[in-house]
Amino acid sequence: MSITGISPITESLASLSTYNDQSITFALEDESYEIYVEDLKKDKKKDKVLLSYYESQHPSSESGDGVDGKMLMVTLSPTKDFWLQANNKEHSVELHKSEKPLPDQAFFVLHNRSFNSVSFESKTDPGVFIGVKDNHLALIKVDYSENLGSENILFKLSEIHHHHHH
């Protein structure tokens, strides 16, 4: 699965929430960022995430699509120089400071389950998705023969129109 260009084809600033409308928030604690899944107080502003969209080619062994076998991959950055990354050993999702080019662990295949819900599949571990477990983000293995619609891997993106990365 190779990224076909080093720069994103588009970017958007969005808030990220679970299928059950809990917010994904990011907090700086002891010089590292923690990720929380929580009900937001009404007056609290939602945290923003910069989504960068990249085109990716299916491995030719996997698909007969040839030039058309493209997927959208995203990276998610809630604050400058930090990106969500898959830790496949620990089955966890972590925020790490990185320089470009970003490691493969920072890329997720975008799945539109419905028009307004998305899932994020780990580039480094196909079949493993960002999901919600015990009020935290985790990596969750999904059996493709089962329904990909399990709510704990579904997220909503609410795009924010003025695009300034903090």
Epitope: I9, T10, S12, Y53, E55, H58, S63, G64, D65, G66, D68, G69, K70, M71, L72, V109, L110, H111, N112, R113, S114, F115, N147, L148, G149, E159, H161
Partner: antibody, heavy 121, light 106 residues
């Protein structure tokens, strides 16, 4: 090579039904959202319906809701549009299109040649 | 629902001209916009996706730009084979086409 072949169009009386089929080849069908778009004679394009890659989510133009049903058979690489209670304003060429990206509802990259549906008494 | 308005509805230009087609959305569509070309008697063909990305096999004289609600398709040097109707199309919220711009030769 990507190919989409629509069939099932024809002349039908108002109030009757018609089922369109679109057979796909040249790509991994089950990975892609599929769409129906129509074009009335001499007019512009109008999105009609969408279905996600596993068939679990479907979307419709307001004017066809409750009358049209989109479905797919991933084993047979086919997407369908069942059209009931047809009206004269449904007269159009109906195109089938595939999503631009695997798993994604963003954009569509290939279109079939279309099948003409004429609703007239 | 998002409405897409294309202008002009008909455009006459000469071979070699730089041609600009406009598409305006009723709400911000976050660059979720494509352009397609339809020649008489043919199915539409994708030219540009996500506002400014050229579809494989499309000549580089075609380019797209824009953001928010305002988008543009530019043909840097019009060729006879570019005579067609051009449609913009948004997929930010539902799926909606513009009314089209018919491009003809002077």
């Amino acid at each position: 090579e990507v190919q989409l072949v629509e069939t099932g169009g024809g002349l039908v009386q108002p109030g009757r039904s018609l089922k369109l089929s679109c057979v796909a080849s040249g790509f991994t069908f089950s990975n892609y959202w599929m769409y129906w778009i129509r074009q009335a004679p001499g007019m512009g394009l109008e999105w009609v319906s969408s279905i996600n890659n596993d068939g679990g989510n479907t979307y419709y133009l307001d004017s066809v809701k409750g009358r049209f049903t989109i479905s797919r058979n991933n084993a047979e690489n086919t997407v369908y549009l069942q059209m009931n209670s047809l009206r004269s304003e449904d007269t159009a060429t109906y195109y089938c299109a595939k999503g631009h990206y695997s798993y994604s509802s963003y954009s569509f990259s290939y279109w079939g040649q279309g099948t003409l549906v004429t609703v007239s008494s | 629902d998002i409405q897409m308005t294309q202008s002009p509805s008909v455009l006459s230009a000469s071979v070699g001209d730089r041609v600009t087609l406009s598409c305006k959305a009723s709400h911000n569509i976050n660059k979720h916009l494509d352009w397609c070309q339809q020649k008489v008697g043919e199915a539409p063909k994708l030219l540009i996706y996500f506002t400014n990305n050229l579809q494989t096999g499309i000549p580089s004289r075609f380019s797209g730009s824009g953001s928010g609600t305002d988008y543009t398709l530019t043909i840097s040097s019009l060729q006879p084979e570019d005579v067609a109707t051009y449609f913009c199309f948004q997929y930010n919220s539902g799926w909606t086409f513009g009314g089209g711009t018919k491009l003809e030769l002077k």
